[in-house]
Amino acid sequence: APISSHCRLDKSNFQQPYITNRTFMLAKEASLADNNTDVRLIGEKLFHGVSMSERCYLMKQVLNFTLEEVLFPQSDRFQPYMQEVVPFLARLSNRLSTCHIEGDDLHIQRNVQKLKDTVKKLGESGEIKAIGELDLLFMSLRNACI
């Protein structure tokens, strides 16, 4: 079972209209540049076999990957949204730094790895897709962690 007290974000993190709006606008702008609409990164497959109490830990992994492998490398694009959204998401990541799972998390790592592989396989268009799904990442993170 996860150490659930650490796998939590305060509701107030998601009750800031300005940054919420900027996150959704960034996602919308990137999704317009996404020509691969058949693939969805944040969907049922990502959460397959993951219990309610493990969802936040999974989303922490997805958030960290998105920041390190997608947003930082693409930080010069989709301005001015990117320069505001990235620090916000980085703060959420920092607040989840003590979120861990005791015991086996292989099923979670397997699901996250499939998402990583899909992004890597698609190359730059995979990174654009991940940015285009920041609205889903924001909402999924909220739903899993509050």
Epitope: A1, K11, F14, I42, G43, E44, F47, H48, G49, V50, S51, M52, S53, R55, L136, M139, S140, R142, N143, A144, I146
Partner: antibody, heavy 119, light 112 residues
Framework: EVQLVESGGGLVQPGGSLRLSCAVS????????MIWVRQAPGKGLEWIGI???????YYASWAKGRFTISRDNSKNTVYLQMNSLRAEDTAVYYC?????????????WGQGTLVTVSS | AVVLTQSPSSLSASVGDRVTITCQAS??????LAWYQQKPGKAPKLLIY???TLASGVPSRFSGSGSGTDFTLTISSLQPEDFATYYC??????????????FGGGTKVEIK
């Protein structure tokens, strides 16, 4: 093909008990949370409770104490145990698969089983 | 617990009509809203989730919109098989789990 089939409904006297079953096929039950929802005749849908992958259960406040959800993954079956039944529990009872996609969505649903509480 | 108010509770329409059903939440539910269709004597069927994402196999004449507290289900051109009752359903996280899932009262779409 994914299928959910409820059974165990019928006529029961007030104060009586009933156990409903939801047999699933076409997917691995152990990978999904499952919910129970009921619908009184001519009325809307009412959530009863949910059983998570790890067996944790959560109930609507009105259902706590009288209703119990359990699962047997080896039998591909989810159960709803109902005790101290009242006339107002008369309804069609549905089970549904909970697909979490970042938000919980219920899909698909079983065909339902009718429970009538009457003397 | 969040309360979902659907309007109208019933409506009469003809084949080919554009139909709009609204669902109002008593508190901010972001985009945590789904729509279900239920035909008489049948189980509910998922139509839309994330307020606007069409479920697999659902015809494109169905669409959803909204966020926060106000949501809309639109059928662009009503077909004979669309006469049914429609329910909105919200997921509310972060509160007590005993009120996580809530359904609206339903909107019955009848033949004019």
């Amino acid at each position: 093909e994914v299928q959910l089939v409820e059974s165990g409904g019928g006529l029961v006297q007030p104060g009586g008990s009933l156990r409903l079953s939801c047999a699933v096929s076409g997917f691995s039950l152990s990978s999904y949370a499952m919910i129970w929802v009921r619908q009184a005749p001519g009325k809307g849908l009412e959530w009863i409770g949910i059983i998570d992958i790890d067996g944790s259960t959560y109930y609507a406040s009105w259902a706590k104490g009288r209703f119990t959800i359990s699962r047997d993954n080896s039998k591909n079956t989810v159960y709803l145990q109902m005790n101290s039944l009242r006339a107002e529990d008369t309804a069609v009872y549905y089970c549904a698969r909970d697909r979490f996609v970042g938000v919980d969505i219920f899909d698909p649903w079983g065909q339902g089983t009718l429970v009538t509480v009457s003397s | 617990a969040v309360v979902l108010t659907q309007s109208p509770s019933s409506l009469s329409a003809s084949v080919g009509d554009r139909v709009t059903i609204t669902c109002q939440a008593s508190e901010d539910i972001y985009t945590n809203l789904a729509w279900y269709q239920q035909k008489p004597g049948k189980a509910p069927k998922l139509l839309i989730y994330w307020a606007s994402t069409l479920a697999s196999g659902v015809p494109s004449r169905f669409s959803g919109s909204g966020s926060g507290t106000d949501f809309t289900l639109t059928i662009s051109s009503l077909q004979p098989e669309d006469f049914a009752t429609y329910y909105c359903q919200a997921c509310v996280y972060g509160n007590s789990a005993d009120s996580r899932y809530t359904f609206g009262g339903g909107t019955k779409v009848e033949i004019k």
